[in-house]
Interface confidence: low
């Protein structure tokens, strides 16, 4: 509550998280021409990448392009990409939604369809939809282990959300425990009123919020943290602004002296935790 | 404007950007000792980085130094670094601006210089200039997609920049389309007074601003971004203190059984999105 | 000081950190059963990542796991991990603190110990502690620089912390240099009272405060930033609470068509730079 | 491995008390919550109790104020004692034990179980 005698001071704040959890994945692997039903094990080296700060992202869902080279080949058939001579294609064009740069040529993608030949990773990915249910479904009961360490400068205060007389077995409860610095992410989609199954196929952002409201006085003194949840990306958002939250990374290799790649495009959650609060002292 | 009756607080912001367009990259590539022109394509997962938060990197140049292995070899003769004789050498010395740990022998480099010999990744990096004009300078036409979600805790108010009106084919522009939040990168340059194609050379920081002046009040309520771009680098910055913005990463692989590496040094342009403002209410 | 009579504003802020250095290290490498004394380089690629904005990290330590494929083995034998029969082990099970999915049977991890089998990448990390004294334990010479650009908006002030009058070849101290911004690591954890050899060994975070109080008055103006150093991180931390800094990352592969992986557990500093302070101007 | 036996169960009058008790055996230095839930004829397994490692204790709604839950450490025990009882309280109780950090409530967290102890409320 706002004490008007008080001098307020905004919160400095540093933030390290740790996720955990393993995350069994189901997929169609084709290798040879047949395709056959591969099971893999992901773990957080697997899934989520070394980040700094107030953010961290864990992968719920991927498409992969493997084996691609740089070459000529017929770009992707999406909706209004195919051809019927060279005249549609014009050499030196990038479009935007394409994957490469086209040499001009109207060339056979399959056997129904042609489509403009372009410079590029190839073959080029294929624009199929993300897989339903995400592969990394289970990643919903991942736990994160949230420290943040607080100071107000002019008030040389220092403090940190975990005190000693916590333990590391507990798990954040809205009413039950509301301290703990330990939550489960389906916990964190439940309290923001989101499905988490859902998000996890386009991926999106999700926000946690720490609030620090503190009233240094020592004869009223507290200092504690708040947590709140509400996705950050919107749901509703038109296709053109590019939905849920993905990139693409790739790994690069040799094969027979040649630079190949294989490009994931991975979709997840992207968590941000926001800091805020006041330290107030007469 | 300053309304003195109203209870102003900061903006909480989260950020997520998404860059477009590809490059074609013309290079001499030397194999086997012949030299030739060497085209290639790269895309989003070649030139940008996952990042997270309010910053995003567009890589605009590189020098590569292939085939790297640990062993013991001259290092680059830089200015000041020649030898005559083993005296010059200091075994395990670690000259900063060198890649190596002196052996305190002095070996021949090539026909005509001789350096210390050094413990390192070899042969060591040539410090050449970066490639003028830069090999990626046609990122000057990708574009970035920028989504700011913020909120005002304290007056339970969330917005976004971009609104259900909005649509994906709009690009940014002062006058005829300010709440456009997909930017050109030689635009937003261009707004800061910039020359991108310089820029590209060395690499340099960019700072897009997004300012939230926001009445909350319902009877005179506004609450829109505006954006304004500026250079953050110091382009006439001491050599000293390394100018542009360039870092170095390794890609690690196995040859015959022996641990390799390409080093990449990277050159390009970080994006650092600003957001600032406060939202008042009687 | 407080001058009430002016209109304050907070900083807005962009850092940009180069890190110098190079670690000799010295482990025991063991190939085709036998082991030797294996000394390696490392350098910025191999010891720091491509990061953005207030956070840099330096790797100090590390443990490694190489040649790990998925399939199934038996999960590390640690305290209470151990079994006799297939009763203890349940067939899906995911232990936080194993690596894998229990097949739900009871195999020999060596020959004297028994523990459940695990689909995972395999074998299985070993559990063992941080090398001590820390691999990289020399980082604690290597040096930073960092360059601060600051803006008040609403005074239409920008400065930065790197000022023409300096060079690049001071190193920060309290009383003799308290302007230059390239700081040597062990200086920084000095002036915190903390021990970089003893840190290095698990991790840890340091903040280094960057404060600007600005009077931006022409007849008393002064704009310069005050550098301090604290430990972010709880060194007291419960066990359960994950005390230190590590996170793990992967180098994947392919031999004989396999995929592959080097786990590494990757222990060091992260480094939060936190700027902040006001401008105020009458 | 971790065994789990529940005892005190019984008929009772509504407005009646009962106490019941669970001893683990085995790897018990794993465990970090344990609970009890229920399961009336004829309807799912439900939530009534729990406790965390640190002695933070969670209550389902419809039992909050008439039981008190409670643990020893040393001896490996919870117990569970129920006041003012009512005739919907009449049900299979489970104890249940994890050793992971998911929330109290959810059934699926729990690695081990005990064979159930019946406890009928008469009116």
């Known amino acids: 509550s706002d004490k008007l005698y008080q001098r307020k001071e905004p919160v400095i704040s540093s933030v390290h998280t740790k996720v955990k959890g393993i995350a069994e994945v189901t997929e169609n692997v084709t290798e040879g021409g047949v395709t056959k039903l591969g099971h893999s094990i992901f773990d957080t080296a697997d899934y989520t990448f070394p980040l700094q700060g107030n953010s961290f992202f864990v992968m719920t869902n991927y498409v992969k392009s493997e084996g691609q080279v740089q070459t000529l080949c017929p770009e992707y058939p999406r909706r209004g990409a195919q051809c019927s001579s060279d005249r549609r294609c014009k050499k030196g064009w990038m479009d935007p939604q394409s994957k490469g740069i086209q040499t001009g040529r109207c060339v056979p993608y399959d056997k129904t369809r042609k489509t403009c030949e372009v410079s590029a990773w190839c073959p080029t990915e294929e624009e199929k939809e993300a897989p339903r249910p995400a592969l990394l479904r289970s990643a919903e009961n991942f736990t994160v282990l949230i420290k943040n360490n607080i100071h107000f400068p002019g008030h040389n205060y220092t403090t940190r959300n975990i005190l000693p007389t916590m333990n590391g077995s507990c798990t954040f409860h809205k009413t039950w425990d509301p301290q703990c610095s330990i939550f489960r992410l389906g916990d964190i989609f439940q309290e923001a009123g989101e499905n988490f199954t859902e998000v996890a196929v386009q991926g999106g952002i999700m926000g946690i919020e720490i609030y620090w409201d503190c009233n240094l006085d020592s004869w009223s003194h507290h200092c504690r943290p708040r947590y709140s949840f509400r996705r950050l990306d919107d749901k509703n958002m038109d296709e053109s602004f590019v939905p849920g939250y993905n990139f693409r990374y790739a790994k690069y290799y040799k094969e027979n002296n040649v630079e190949k790649r294989t490009l994931i495009k991975a979709f997840g959650i992207r968590f941000d935790i926001l800091v805020f609060g006041t330290g107030g002292k007469f | 404007s300053d309304k003195l009756y109203q209870r102003k607080e900061p903006v909480i912001s989260s950020v997520h950007t998404k860059v477009k367009g590809i490059a074609e990259v013309t290079e001499n590539v030397t194999e086997g000792g012949v030299t030739k022109l060497g085209h290639s394509i790269f895309d989003t997962a070649d030139y940008t980085f996952p990042l997270q938060g309010n910053s995003f990197f567009v890589m605009t140049n590189y020098v590569k130094s292939e085939g790297q292995v640990q062993t013991l070899c001259p290092e680059y003769p830089r200015r000041g670094a020649q030898c005559s004789s083993d005296r010059r050498c200091k075994k395990g010395w670690m000259d900063p601006q060198s890649k190596g740990i002196q052996t305190g022998r002095c070996v021949p480099y090539d026909k005509t210089r001789k350096t210390c010999e050094v413990s390192a990744w070899c042969p060591t990096e040539e410090e050449k200039e970066a490639p003028r004009p830069a090999l990626l300078r046609s990122a000057e036409n990708f574009t970035v997609l920028i989504k700011n979600n913020i909120h005002f805790p304290g007056h339970n108010y969330t917005t976004r920049n971009i609104l259900p009106t909005m649509n994906g084919s709009c690009t940014f522009h002062k006058t005829w389309d300010p709440q456009c939040s997909i930017f050109r990168l030689g635009d937003i340059f261009q707004e800061a007074g910039e020359n991108f194609t310089e820029v590209a050379v060395q690499g340099g920081i960019m700072g897009i601003e997004i300012y939230w002046d926001c009445n909350l009040d319902s009877w005179s309520h506004h609450c829109r971004p505006r954006y304004s771009f500026r250079r953050l680098d110091d382009k006439n910055m001491d050599e000293s203190f390394v100018p542009g913005y360039n870092f170095r990463y390794a890609k690690y692989y196995k040859e015959n059984n022996v641990e390799k590496r390409t080093l990449i040094k990277a050159f390009g342009i970080r994006f650092d999105i600003l957001v600032f403002g406060t939202g008042g209410k009687f | 000081s407080d001058k009430l009579y002016q209109r304050k504003e907070p900083v807005i802020s962009s850092v940009h950190t180069k890190v110098k250095g190079i670690a000799e290290v010295t482990e025991n490498v063991t190939e085709g059963g036998v082991t030797k004394l294996g000394h390696s380089i490392f350098d910025t690629a191999d010891y720091t990542f491509p990061l953005q904005g207030n956070s840099f990290f330096v790797m100090t330590n590390y443990v490694k796991s190489e040649g790990q494929v998925q399939t199934l083995c038996p999960e590390y034998p640690r305290r209470g991990a151990q079994c006799s029969s297939d009763r203890r082990c349940k067939k899906g099970w995911m232990d936080p603190q194993s690596k894998g999915i229990q097949t739900g049977r009871c195999v020999p991890y060596d020959k004297t110990r028994k523990t459940c089998e695990v689909s995972a990448w395999c074998p299985t990390e070993e559990e063992k502690e941080a090398p001590r004294p820390a691999l990289l334990r020399s980082a604690e010479n290597f040096t930073v620089l960092i360059k601060n650009n600051i803006h008040f908006p609403g005074h239409n002030y920008t400065t930065r912390n790197i000022l023409p009058t300096m060079n690049g070849s001071c190193t920060f101290h309290k009383t003799w240099d308290p302007q230059c911004s390239i700081f040597r690591l062990g200086d920084i954890f000095q002036e915190a009272g903390e021990n970089f050899t003893e840190v290095a060994v698990q991790g840890g975070i340091m903040g280094i405060e960057i404060y600007w109080d600005c009077n931006l008055d022409s007849w008393s103006h002064h704009c310069r930033p005050r550098y301090s150093f604290r430990r972010l991180d709880d060194k007291n931390m419960d066990e359960s609470f994950v005390p230190g800094y590590n996170f793990r990352y992967a180098k994947y592969y392919k031999e004989n068509n396999v995929e592959k992986r080097t786990l590494i557990k990757a222990f060091g500093i992260r480094f939060d730079i936190l700027v902040f302070g006001t401008g105020g101007k009458f | 491995e971790v065994q789990l036996v529940e005892s005190g169960g019984g008929l009772v009058q509504a407005g009646g008390s009962l106490r019941l008790s669970c001893v683990a055996s085995?790897?018990?230095?794993?465990?970090?919550?344990m609970g009890w839930f229920r399961q009336a004829p004829g309807k799912e397994r439900e939530f009534v109790a729990a406790i965390s490692g640190i002695g933070a204790i969670h209550y389902a709604d419809s039992v909050k104020g008439r039981f008190t839950l409670s643990r020893d450490n040393a001896r490996n025990t919870v117990s569970l004692h129920m006041n003012s009882l009512k005739p919907e309280d009449t049900a299979v109780y489970y104890c249940?034990?994890?050793?992971?950090?998911?929330?109290?409530?959810?059934?699926?967290?729990?690695?081990?179980w005990g064979q159930g102890t019946q406890v009928t409320v008469s009116s």
């Open positions: 085995g790897r018990t230095f794993s465990i970090l919550t």
């Open positions: 249940a034990a994890k050793a992971n950090y998911e929330s109290p409530s959810r059934e699926t967290s729990y690695a081990y």
